[in-house]
Interface confidence: low
């Protein structure tokens, strides 16, 4: 025998103290696939999340964050605070990226500048708390009669100018 | 929808030099940086750099600096990757990758393959 | 770099019963924010890889309920708590600390 509720599209839901009969949801639930028993209470969008979709009778609603703020988890199950360029959140809050490392973005951590005398280049332009070092030319090619035996540049600290 | 379309499969000479592009799409792409990754025949998968899409600065593996630029175009909202000096070593499979929240790749590219062949 | 080390690298399942793949990280991936950079990834056969799992813990959007992230140091583990078989594939773990990013070999879950 088939189940009778097997009947019932989404959007709908199979009311047992109805006889089985396929009742609409109600009011801010929803049933997102045929069959069901029950229908589901839609997610509400309060506080620091605000509302991308609005729930339907076959969708629930869909969350995203206020302004200064972006998602975290399966479908923005948290928000989290925005910083500013040069800074990343800790759990105290925003706060500025120590000396040597960057972040040029809103969110995401602070990391090292690159180390230009790794790859036996000078530093063309120092870091700063929002930019990663630029790294030149080696320093071997910094004049044009430098022999190939030029003994490479000291190892510096990065985003510190050749002296 | 959000997604990376990829330039199709290639095949270059061993010394030549090829680019691949990753257009974006269902989004703001400065807002988020691309970063490239690729998989060689029974290797792990192997980060190679990243765009910081809205400002244009990139930061590479040590693995491939000198050999890889990632470059994008904000207008035509595309990522490009282009590596030199190919090798039989660079078959592999390129993919583009939009970093999300945290570092995490959310959404990547189909991938695109590139054989090096004489 | 940071070295990730996965294990095992083969893992042969019956579908119903759960899975486990370990991860674990030559350095410390517990940022000042209190979130572990760790992701895992899976690369089903022909398609490019997903992201399952960020910072440790967290699933990613339209991941089911059965992938759980968990921490414990250096080492982490991606569970599964009853395999399906659109979970076969390879299992990558990836730290995004630290420039470069660095992946594990991988773990390649098949049926038994």
């Known amino acids: 025998l088939q189940d009778p509720c097997s009947n019932c599209p989404a959007g709908t839901f199979c009311d047992n103290n109805r006889n089985q009969i396929c009742s609409p949801c109600p009011p801010n639930s929803f049933s997102s696939a045929g069959g069901q028993r029950t229908c589901d209470i839609c997610r509400q969008c309060k506080g620091v999340f605000r509302t991308r979709k609005e729930c339907s009778s076959t969708s629930n609603a869909e969350c995203d964050c206020t302004p200064g703020f972006h998602c975290l988890g399966a479908g923005c199950s948290m928000c989290e605070q925005d910083c500013k360029q040069g800074q990343e959140l800790t759990k105290k809050g925003c706060k500025d990226c120590c000396f040597g490392t960057f972040n040029d973005q809103k969110r995401g951590i602070c990391r090292p500048w690159t180390n230009c005398s790794l790859d036996g280049k000078s530093v063309l332009v120092n870091g700063t708390k929002e930019r990663d070092v630029v790294c030149g030319p080696s320093p071997a090619d910094l004049s044009p009669g430098a022999s190939s035996v030029t003994p490479p540049a000291p190892a510096r600290e990065p985003g510190h100018s050749p002296q | 929808q959000v997604q990376l379309v990829q330039s199709g499969a290639d095949v270059k000479k061993p010394g030549a030099s090829v680019r691949v592009s990753c257009k974006a799409s269902g989004y703001t792409f400065t807002s988020y940086p691309i970063h490239w990754v690729r998989q060689a025949p029974g290797h792990r998968l192997e980060w190679m750099g990243w765009s910081n899409a809205g400002i244009g600065n990139a930061k590479y593996s040590q693995e491939f600096q000198g050999r890889v630029t990632i470059t994008r175009d904000t207008s035509a909202s595309t990522a490009y990757m282009d590596l030199s000096s190919l090798t039989s070593e660079d078959l592999a499979v390129y993919y583009c990758?939009?970093?999300?929240?945290?570092?995490?790749?959310?959404?990547w590219g189909q991938g695109t393959m590139v054989t090096v062949s004489a | 770099d940071i070295v990730m080390t996965q294990s095992p690298l083969s893992l042969p399942v019956t579908p119903g019963e759960p899975a486990s793949i370990s991860c674990r990280s030559s350095?410390?991936?517990?940022?000042?924010?209190?979130?572990?950079?760790l992701d895992w990834y899976l690369h089903k056969p022909g398609q490019s890889p997903q992201l399952l799992i960020y910072?440790?813990?967290i699933r990613a959007s339209g991941v089911p309920d059965r992938f759980s992230g968990s921490e414990s140091g250096t080492d982490f583990t991606l569970k599964i708590s009853r395999v399906e078989a659109e979970d076969v594939g390879i299992y990558y773990c990836?730290?995004?600390?630290?420039?470069?990013?660095?992946f594990g070999q991988g773990t390649k879950l098949e049926l038994k």
């Open positions: 990758a939009r970093e999300g929240v945290a570092g995490a790749f959310d959404i």
């Open positions: 350095q410390n991936l517990l940022h000042s924010n209190g979130y572990n950079y």
């Open positions: 990836m730290q995004p600390l630290q420039i470069p990013y660095t």
């Open positions: 910072l440790g813990s």
